[in-house]
């Protein structure tokens, strides 16, 4: 297993609709054809997997149908979008990149993107 540098923004504020997008960029030492991207969430010392996708270079990322993540790839960059976020989902979202094929296997873990989610103010009751 060889180490690889992964860069991601330090902090992002999600939209009022609970959507957060950020770029995860990895310094690929070789010409990988198969890449796996995993998003981990760390909050209060707990780490949980949010979503993961394996893709062939030049193809779209495919997450599971019920995943809250979507993404696109361009060269050594992955554009990740996480949706359906609420205030309770605020935390550090860490991008983990694995170059699966061809060998050697490379692993890179970013420092994390602190995503803040602000629940929208409830609308005042109306008479209509």
């Amino acid at each position: 297993c060889k180490a690889m540098h992964v860069a991601q923004p330090a902090v992002v504020l999600a939209s009022s609709r609970g959507i957060a997008s950020f770029v995860c960029e990895y310094a690929s030492p070789g010409k990988a054809t198969e890449v796996r991207v995993t998003v981990l969430r760390q909050a209060d010392s707990q780490v949980t997997e949010v979503c993961a996708a394996t893709y062939m270079m030049g193809n779209e990322l495919t997450f599971l149908d019920d995943s809250i993540c979507t993404g696109t790839s361009s060269g050594n960059q992955v554009n990740l979008t996480i949706q359906g976020l609420r205030a309770m989902d605020t935390g550090l979202y860490i991008c983990k990149v694995e170059l699966m094929y061809p060998p050697p296997y490379y692993l890179g873990i970013g420092n994390g993107t602190q995503i803040y989610v602000i629940d929208p103010e409830p609308c005042p009751d109306s008479d209509f």
Partner: antibody, heavy 116, light 108 residues
């Protein structure tokens, strides 16, 4: 090294607007947030809000909502805070700071005096 | 809005003594997202602690933070002359983010 340099002191009349700038250097501007905090003379710190320089999304203190606007110019790595309809109790030192989880780097502060 | 109440308002101690500052929240602070700042007259605040217990870069280990939920503490194990200042807590776990009113640590 990381530096945040704010614009100079301002004297404004009640009802006017003020726009304070905060120029960042020494780091990747769009990777961080900019938080704004003010401090009235002899008083404590008051959080005003923050902006994500990555996407421009903002979160304002409710008491300032409608009067405050925070923006960034990523081409010059500068953040701006505009406060409208100024009142005498807006007299304060206004600070910007680089935000992730706490403000680790601060500007030097901008004194805004509101007086007729 | 979470109200942070700092106590005591003023702490009179001598250099070398231990200082214990409290910050109580009106409701639980999510993810232990609480920071402590030090401020000296005429200067911008300085971040000491974030995430309730993580020391910021370059902060001496005599400063430590602890707590969760609604009760947080900043401890200065042995006061140095340069530690006499005003200390603020700030929560950023629940919007709107808020500061406490401050605790002044003065020389006895």
């Amino acid at each position: 090294q990381v530096q945040l340099v704010q614009s100079g002191a301002e004297v404004k009349k009640p009802g006017a607007s003020v726009k304070v700038s905060c120029k960042a250097s020494g780091y990747t501007f769009t990777s961080y947030g900019i938080s704004w905090v003010r401090q009235a003379p002899g008083q404590g710190l008051e959080w005003m809000g923050w902006i994500s320089a990555y996407n421009g999304n903002t979160n304002y203190a409710q008491k300032l909502q409608g009067r405050v606007t925070m923006t960034t110019d990523t081409s010059t790595s500068t953040a701006y805070m505009e406060l409208r309809s100024l009142r005498s109790d807006d007299t304060a030192v206004y600070y910007c700071g680089r935000w992730v989880r706490g403000v680790e780097y601060w500007g030097q502060g901008t004194l805004v005096t509101v007086s007729s | 809005e979470i109200v942070l109440t700092q106590s005591p308002a003023t702490l009179s101690l001598s250099p070398g003594e231990r200082a214990t500052l409290s910050c109580g929240a009106s409701q639980s602070v999510n993810n232990r997202y609480l920071a402590w700042y030090q401020q000296k007259p005429g200067l911008a605040p300085r971040l000491l602690i974030y995430d309730a217990s993580t020391r910021a870069t370059g902060i001496p280990d005599r400063f430590s933070g602890s707590g969760s939920g609604t009760d947080f503490t900043l401890t200065i194990s042995r006061l140095e002359p340069e530690d006499f200042a005003v200390y603020y807590c700030q929560q950023y776990g629940n919007s709107p983010w808020t500061f406490g009113q401050g605790t002044k640590v003065e020389i006895k």
